[in-house]
Amino acid sequence: GLECDGKVNICCKKQFFVSFKDIGWNDWIIAPSGYHANYCEGECPSHIAGTSGSSLSFHSTVINHYRMRGHSPFANLKSCCVPTKLRPMSMLYYDDGQNIIKKDIQNMIVEECGCS
Amino acid sequence: GLECDGKVNICCKKQFFVSFKDIGWNDWIIAPSGYHANYCEGECPSHIAGTSGSSLSFHSTVINHYRMRGHSPFANLKSCCVPTKLRPMSMLYYDDGQNIIKKDIQNMIVEECGCS
């Protein structure tokens, strides 16, 4: 997965820090106060849809085979720049019963982006 | 994740059968001869971006907080209808050295779709 460097507009991972205070979650999330969530942005030209490096690669390679041949309904299906690898992160927070919970929350951090 | 029923145009999972013969893979994939790969299609209006049910939900909920507040650069970031849950499938095939391999291939079947 590409890291965005400002030079290319092809699907890449952009660094982004989320502050839980900014989004009003600091009253139930004890720690951390924020984290590098990152996000995906950029174009998905046909030649990189479903290319290797994406964890969706088998499925998207198959679908891309049909898309590129103009097979209905895939011809009009947009390939999207989305997270293809996410990482969990440990959080300390209050649950609904105000108990303090320490838990690894799945799919918090975008590690890689790819074209769906 | 919604199943497409033809009545709604909101992000949903559409049934689709892939024939390996159709895409020229039948000379190296021994079994199966095809499979229900499925795919995702439909609109992602802002109110359903990052909704629960998606394996991206924590991350996309966070990003959606920023997007809904018109926070640059998320205001212009498109929410996409993409696979949020994929399932592996067992395949019997010839590898690069013409050895017969039986392997569970990850991310072959779309089980659920959601808005990124």
Partner: antibody, heavy 123, light 108 residues
């Protein structure tokens, strides 16, 4: 058996174009990608790009973007590589090779190669 | 892009000796998607090893590959006269596909 047979040697002037062909036989052409690799005299191997024989999807090496075009003709199971605005440093043996670029299945090595086509660029 | 560095550049050995060729990647090669090719003068490269350690069809068992991540090795247990050639490693984990600079195994 699998074979990739390439067109014959070419001599071109700087600024001209060359089109090398690669005819495949012994397998389902559309099930694979065709990659192009070149080798300057006495040098190592340089990947130029690939084309999916099924869909026509291409992926080119950045340094060749704008000068190279890869195409296929599925009716004759032939892949083509055209290189334009030739320079003396494009003098090389050009190879085609087949691969299945499916990472999830562990596939992607170049298992069969063409015999190579020598392209000489000289004024 | 992933840069592959092969060492040594030249290996001078006698038939019957063991050859150890190294290939180092500038970043991790995902899932060991690394291949080794043999090239003799005037010939196209030939696939020897794929997936870092699997032998291609018809390749004798004196050839073996090992390694993962960033460090990979091709070993020829007992050199035969026909093994004197140039050997290239290549990664197929990422685009662009890249090759190492090659190691020439020559007769001492």
């Amino acid at each position: 058996q699998v074979q990739l047979v390439q067109s014959g040697a070419e001599v071109k002037k700087p600024g001209a174009s060359v089109k090398v062909s690669c005819k495949a036989s012994g397998y389902t052409f559309t099930g694979y990608h065709i990659h192009w690799v070149r080798q300057a005299p006495g040098q190592g191997l340089e990947w130029m790009g690939h084309i999916s024989a099924y869909s026509g999807t291409t992926n080119y090496a950045q340094k060749l973007q704008g000068r190279v075009t890869m195409t296929t003709d599925t009716s004759t199971s032939t892949a083509y590589m055209e290189l334009r605005s030739l320079r003396s440093d494009d003098t090389a043996v050009y190879y085609c090779a087949r691969a299945r670029d499916i990472a999830a299945a562990g596939l992607g090595a170049f298992d069969y190669w063409g015999q190579g086509t020598l392209v000489t660029v000289s004024s | 892009e992933i840069v592959l560095t092969q060492s040594p550049g030249t290996l001078s050995l006698s038939p019957g000796e063991r050859a150890t060729l190294s290939c180092r990647a500038s970043q991790s090669v995902r899932s060991s998607y690394l291949a080794w090719y043999q090239q003799k003068p005037g010939q196209a490269p030939r696939l020897l090893i794929y997936g870092a350690s699997s032998r291609a069809t018809g390749i004798p068992d004196r050839f073996s590959g090992s390694g993962s991540g960033t460090d990979f090795t091709l070993t020829i247990s007992r050199l035969e006269p026909e093994d004197f050639a140039v050997y290239y490693c290549q990664q197929y984990s990422n685009y662009p596909r890249t090759f190492g600079g090659g190691t020439k195994v020559e007769i001492k």
